[in-house]
């Protein structure tokens, strides 16, 4: 029987800057039970806090509702693993929630088959920021990618939209099944998961010609 | 609606001890840190000791360290301030306080009152 | 320790006088919290993160100042601002109040 092993806070994300959590691995048990508390304070104060929300984050995490979210402040957290032998820390985690923000994935995505008369033919491709992020406020810049690839080829085809939330593609394959994903990055942060894949058959009359 | 009440105050020899309960309603007790405050007769206002939501963190005011202890029952949502060695100079209204966010006391309980005398 | 010093102790302030109060603090702060206490009543929270209005705060309430020096300001004097006003510190252990400004009404 032995003191716990060394925990480490290995990753903290946020939706929209408003919430975030952190998660932790912990070390050995030592062959005993374990309580694990995280603790932090924020910079330029020195009066630490305990974790508000061990629930909602799942097992070895801590959720930060708003009321303990500050954007601009830097927090420093680490967690402690206590049993009856003794207790260890994990390494001091600095976290900015500016820099950890990872969108949930855009929202409403609609795929369609344009064939002007005039003009080639071309895929057009329409979705909507995720719910949680709001663009008004002018914190956020979201850029978007898109992928997409015939229903059985195993190379995804990634086109970069930019700011934008719809795009044009012209270079199909006339006849084959395309499946169609978005997803979204703040300026800073991380790419969201890709949304559900939407499915759009590409007619056999589609011309590729000029 | 968030209340605090404060109990078990009254009359305390030097040197005695009493525990003073705080029974928080209307708020998820077990995520705020929380505090007492104390105002002694015509004084100001005195922070006396933090927990923290799941007690991992403990302060306390240097007047009353060694012989005050905070803690908390989060299942039955209550604070506690055990005290000891109990002097003159701890002849005060208590208050039962929460932390909110980072917005120290924003809810006060009514208070109760702690005379020590001979 | 963070000592929190309070000036005036006593002001007086006739009906829709500008009042200023200040706090000083002995170290660099990032935020200050005022309280309003009326005679035997409990304090209420009055303004937080400096420059914040708590809850029911009346707009003619301010607050302001940064680094070891800040103030409260009301705009326009009214009886029902008579009251002890606290201006404390929670950023570091200890955590302090200032001694307190009573302001009365002319």
């Known amino acids: 029987q032995l003191p716990p092993g060394k925990p480490e806070i290995f990753k903290c994300r946020s939706p929209n800057k408003e919430t975030f959590t952190c998660w932790w691995r912990p070390g050995t048990d030592g062959g005993l039970p374990t309580n694990y508390s995280l603790t932090y304070h924020r910079e330029g104060e020195t009066l630490m806090h305990e974790c508000p929300d061990y629930i909602t984050g799942g097992p070895n995490s801590c959720h930060f509702g708003k009321q303990y979210t500050s954007m601009w402040r830097t927090y420093i957290m680490m967690v402690n693993a206590t049993n009856q032998m003794g207790s260890s820390f994990s390494d001091e985690l600095y976290v900015d929630v500016t820099y950890i923000v990872q969108p949930d994935p855009p929202l409403e995505l609609a795929v369609e088959v344009k064939q002007p008369e005039d003009r080639k033919p071309y895929l057009w491709i329409k979705w909507s920021p995720p719910t949680l992020i709001d663009l008004k406020t002018g914190w956020f810049t979201l850029l978007y990618e898109i992928r997409l690839k015939p229903e059985k080829a195993a190379e995804w085809e990634i086109h970069f939209a930019g700011q934008q939330t719809e795009f044009k593609i012209l270079s199909l394959h006339p006849g084959q099944k395309y499946l169609v994903q978005v997803r979204c990055k703040p300026d800073h942060g991380y790419w969201s998961a890709w949304s559900p894949a939407t499915f759009i058959q590409i007619p056999s009359d589609f011309t590729m010609n000029d | 609606e968030v209340m605090l009440v404060e109990s078990g105050g009254g009359l305390v020899q030097p040197g005695g001890s009493r525990k003073l309960s705080c029974a928080a309603s209307?708020?998820?007790?077990?995520?705020?840190?929380m505090n007492w405050v104390r105002q002694a007769p015509e004084k100001g206002l005195e922070w006396v000791a933090y927990?923290?939501?799941?007690?991992?963190?403990?302060y306390y005011a240097d007047t009353v360290k060694g012989r005050f202890t905070i803690s908390r029952d989060n299942p039955k949502n209550t604070l506690f301030l055990q005290m000891t060695s109990l002097r003159s100079e701890d002849t005060a209204m208590y208050y039962c306080?929460?932390?909110?966010?980072?917005?120290?006391?924003?809810?006060w309980g009514q208070g109760t009152t702690l005379t020590v005398s001979s | 320790d963070i000592v929190m010093t309070q000036s005036p102790a006593i002001m007086s302030a006739s009906p829709g006088e500008k009042v200023t109060m200040t706090c000083s603090a002995s170290?660099?702060?990032?935020?200050m919290h005022w309280y309003q206490q009326k005679s035997s009543t409990s304090p209420k929270l009055w303004i937080y993160?400096?420059?914040k209005l708590a809850s029911g705060v009346p707009g003619r309430f301010s607050g302001s100042g940064s680094g070891n020096s800040y103030s409260l300001t009301t705009s326009s004097m009214e009886a029902e601002d008579v009251a002890t006003y606290y201006c404390?510190?929670?950023?570091?252990?200890?955590?302090?109040f200032g001694g307190g400004t009573k302001l009365e009404i002319k």
């Open positions: 209307g708020f998820t007790f077990s995520s705020f840190g």
């Open positions: 993160d400096t420059s």
């Open positions: 306080t929460r932390f909110y966010g980072y917005i120290p006391f924003d809810y």
């Open positions: 927990i923290s939501s799941g007690s991992s963190i403990i």
């Open positions: 170290s660099s702060l990032i935020y």
């Open positions: 404390f510190q929670g950023s570091g252990y200890p955590l302090t």
